[in-house]
């Protein structure tokens, strides 16, 4: 069959809240995918299953099951959300994050996705790998792309 | 009931263009795959392309590509195939036909056929 | 691309007759889950193409059960068990297993 193509487009929002008592960081991050389907039959979407990483440390997980039918030479566009909590070990980030000295707060985010399709039955999974920037310091929704973080550590896709 | 009804015969010179049309009727015109064959005088079929009428994404066979540009309107329930630098090559009755999305049918209706003659 | 190639490229039938049509292709039509896009067509003169069986032997709507298809991986058979005459035309194979789709290069039922 003719491959399922998953392009991880970038972040659409985050948004932010805090415990000060904790020094924790709560992020709740929406990421979009571009599912195209190059086969002449149709296939099924049947979960997403993402994470997101900061200093090679996951700080959150999210899976969505039974998502959509996607028609034969067809594309959709599906939004996911991951909650991710940066606190613990990371909580020196609150400081950074809460400094009101500067406009932007980005931090690094690796953001990882599994995509699982189906077809009568049996299943293809692909997966994506980005670097995200995302500004822990305010709620922030961005132009498609815009997040983006150029590394020569991430590798090509 | 299920009908495509293509355009009439067109004649035209070499080196022009030449927009074939085929109208659907009866069935949901964005659940089926819209593909084109060819038949030149005394020979076989041969398939040129599709496209999904929904998402307008098309595949060619490598042999039409440049050649022909499929396209459709979803508000007419219309398909279009268009034909450019027309050769003598090009003189064949074409074909539009539908494949659902699920199953393993394959062009289970088609058109009457399209009728290209390139003249001078 | 897959070639399918077809056998006989033309049959001399009598009304009654029983025939058999073959369809080869360069690879097998089996995709990775299993199901095997191959169908077959009539095209009579001065009609449009229809089609009588996909996915390898199901009858399409319609279609009188003296035609049968059977085959697997590279290898396919159209029978015909009584001919009449509204059968004689040119019969195709196509694979639509493989993009691009590709077609047989048909089989004359004539007449004697």
């Known amino acids: 069959p003719r491959s399922i193509d998953v392009k991880y487009i970038g972040v659409k929002s985050a948004y932010v809240s805090y415990d000060v008592q904790k020094r924790t960081i709560y992020l709740n991050i929406t990421n979009t995918l571009n599912i195209t389907n190059n086969n002449y039959y149709s296939v099924e979407v049947e979960n997403i299953t993402a994470q997101v990483q900061f200093s090679k440390t996951v700080i959150g997980k999210a899976r969505l099951n039974n998502i959509t039918i996607i028609g034969p030479l067809d594309m959709k566009q599906i939004d996911y959300t991951v909650p991710t909590v940066i606190a613990e070990e990371m909580s020196y980030m609150y400081d950074f994050c809460t400094l009101i000295s500067i406009k932007v707060h980005n931090i690094v985010l690796m953001m990882q996705v599994t995509v699982t399709t189906t077809y009568f039955g049996h299943s293809e999974q692909i997966s994506q790998e980005r670097y995200q920037y995302v500004d822990c310091g305010r709620n922030t929704t961005y132009q498609l792309g815009q997040s983006e973080y150029l590394n020569v550590l991430q590798p090509q896709q | 009931q299920v009908q495509l009804q293509q355009s009439g015969a067109e004649l035209v010179r070499p080196g022009t263009s030449v927009r074939v049309s085929c109208k659907a009727s009866?069935?949901?015109?964005?659940?089926?795959?819209i593909e084109w064959i060819k038949q030149r005088p005394g020979q076989g079929l041969e398939w040129i392309g599709v496209?999904?009428?929904?998402?307008?994404?098309?595949d060619y066979s490598e042999k039409f590509k440049g050649k022909a540009r499929l396209t459709a309107d979803k508000s007419s329930s219309t398909a279009y195939m268009q034909l450019s630098s027309l050769t003598s090559d090009d003189s064949a009755v074409y074909f539009c036909?539908?494949?659902?999305?699920?199953?393993?049918?394959?062009?289970?209706?088609w058109g009457q056929g399209t009728t290209v003659t390139v003249s001078s | 691309d897959v070639v399918v190639t077809q056998t006989p490229l033309s049959l001399p039938v009598s009304f009654g007759d029983q025939v058999s049509i073959s369809c080869r292709s360069s690879?097998?039509?089996?995709?990775?889950?299993?199901?095997?896009?191959l169908s077959w067509y009539l095209h009579t003169p001065g009609q449009s193409p229809q089609l009588l069986i996909f996915?390898?032997?199901n009858r399409f709507s319609g279609v009188p059960d003296r035609f049968s298809g059977s085959g697997s991986g590279t290898d396919f058979t159209l029978k015909i068990s009584t001919i009449k005459p509204e059968d004689l035309g040119v019969y195709y194979c196509?694979?639509?297993?493989?993009?691009?789709?590709?077609f047989g290069g048909g089989t004359k039922l004539e007449m004697k």
């Open positions: 496209i999904n009428p929904g998402s307008g994404i098309t």
């Open positions: 036909t539908r494949s659902p999305f699920i199953t393993t049918v394959v062009a289970d209706y």
């Open positions: 196509l694979q639509g297993t493989h993009p691009p789709r590709t």
């Open positions: 690879q097998s039509l089996a995709n990775t889950y299993g199901n095997t896009y």
């Open positions: 009866g069935y949901a015109f964005t659940n089926y795959l």
């Open positions: 996915g390898i032997s």
